[in-house]
């Protein structure tokens, strides 16, 4: 049986997700992120809420957070651009673009991920991959190496049931099932990848993990294509 990675997943194949980023605060993993262009990482706006006095950096090319790896490199952040409509008390518009101090050195372990521009819902039941260095069990253990899990997309109507997220899931958000397998604390800002394309970003709300009645919530990147393009331009 799975030994509780991400929640209910497993250790990722090293460097098989070259788009994966660790957004770090004062040298410690804070949130996930995804390289969407040579000099830009997409993450979640809420991740930087408490980072006012700290040093924010982005780690690329990593599998282990602690061990030396030839592909690993820590980049300073030149500019942090949260979505203008993001707010501390809601999960809406929970996107953040981080401009690296320089273009990332690309290679087999560092490569941008194509992101979805067609604003159409992913079909319910589609298996999507979510990865991160977030907690891996209900004790709160944090892993050193990247973890991942495959999750089926959940239709919005089910996700919006009163027993689930009670109408909070707008058309700009999507859900994935959370029955024991789930993204969790520390995975926020990381990528939800369907068919090799970035479809969603893990939101950073205060959701209970691994409870099937509280599905994972992801910001649909296609719904924010215009904003992403305007910042990257």
């Amino acid at each position: 049986p799975p030994r509780g990675r991400i929640l209910g997943g497993r250790e990722a194949e090293a460097h098989a997700r070259p788009y994966m980023a660790s957004v770090q605060l004062n040298g410690a993993h804070l949130c996930g992120g995804v390289l969407v262009a040579e000099q830009w990482v997409l993450s979640a706006a809420h991740c930087l809420e408490d980072a006012a006095d700290g040093k924010v950096q982005v780690l690329l090319g990593a599998h282990s957070l602690s061990q030396p790896e030839p592909s690993k490199r820590l980049y300073d952040v030149l500019r942090a651009v949260p979505h203008p409509d993001s707010q501390p008390d809601t999960i809406d518009h929970d996107l953040l673009l981080l401009q690296l101090s320089e273009k990332a050195t690309l290679g087999p372990a560092v490569r941008p991920l194509p992101w979805q521009r067609v604003d159409r819902d992913v079909a319910p039941g589609t298996l999507c991959d979510v990865a991160g260095w977030g907690i891996v069990n209900h004790a709160g253990r944090r892993p050193d190496s990247l973890q991942h899990v495959l999750l089926p997309v959940l239709d919005r109507a089910t996700c919006n049931r009163r027993t689930h997220h009670d109408g909070a899931i707008t058309e700009r958000l999507m859900c994935a099932e959370s029955n024991r397998r789930d993204s969790c604390k520390g995975d926020s800002g990381g990528p939800l990848v369907c068919g090799g394309v970035l479809e969603g970003v893990v939101t950073s709300g205060s959701r209970v993990c691994g409870n099937r009645k509280k599905p994972g919530i992801y910001t649909r990147v296609a719904s924010y294509a215009a904003w992403i393009d305007s910042v990257l331009a």
Epitope: P2, R3, G4, R141, K185
Partner: antibody, heavy 113, light 106 residues
């Protein structure tokens, strides 16, 4: 070095309440879960509950529901356990722990008239 | 809630001897933690997620198991291993402990 410093021993009367503290150093309590564990004299360990200090979400073993309250103050990097309506059955050592990997030294609570 | 039964409750072993203790779950769990506690001290985690050795724990300790049956093994008993050992499951809320196995040195 990660450390959890717990408050000192308590001698309290039956029916009273007590609030224990657990102050963390060298890590941010918001990054993981903080748990409280009870150990009665010469007995085993019992999980009381946990808190996610980032948002205040808590989870308790049902048998401690109504007896225990767990809170956290992220500005002081401290977790708290409050116990109410104390009886002799609550006489125990109470441990705080970060994600079950680092543990405080324990706080002894004695309930006696 | 899931009841964890540890056996034996008390055991003794000579230095250098192999020691195995078990933790039986009332229903299936996905993974197990093991802790060591010496008198007057706080518990310390030995094994997480069934078989992973915690930082700083000697390699003579190992964990294994699945479903309802889990075990902790000490490949060669040392005097400093005399302690009480607890299992705990992190699969199903509430997250229960076993009653403990007290290991003494012969």
């Amino acid at each position: 070095e990660v450390q959890l410093q717990q408050s000192g021993a308590e001698l309290v009367k039956p029916g009273a309440s007590v609030k224990l503290s657990c102050t963390a150093s060298d890590f941010n309590i918001k990054d993981t879960y903080m748990h409280w564990v009870m150990q009665r004299p010469e007995q085993g360990l019992e999980w009381i509950g946990k808190i996610d200090p980032a948002n205040g979400n808590t989870e308790f073993d049902p048998k401690f529901q109504g007896k225990a309250t767990i809170t956290a103050d992220t500005s002081s990097n401290t977790a708290y356990l409050q116990l109410t309506s104390l009886t002799s059955e609550d006489t125990a050592v109470y441990y705080c722990t970060r994600a079950m990997d680092y543990w405080g030294q324990g706080t002894s609570v004695t309930v006696s008239s | 809630q899931i009841v964890l039964t540890q056996s034996p409750a008390i055991m003794s072993a000579s230095p250098g001897e192999k020691v195995t203790m078990t933790c039986s779950a009332g229903s299936s769990v996905s993974y197990m933690y093991w802790y060591q506690q010496k008198p007057g001290s706080s518990p310390r985690v030995l094994i997480y997620d069934t078989s992973n050795l915690a930082s700083g724990v000697p390699v003579r300790f190992s964990g294994s198991g699945s479903g309802t049956s889990y075990s902790l093994t000490i490949s060669r008993m040392e005097a400093e291993d005399a302690a009480t050992y607890y299992c705990q499951q992190w699969s199903n809320y509430p997250y229960t402990f076993g009653g403990g196995t007290k290991l003494e040195i012969k």
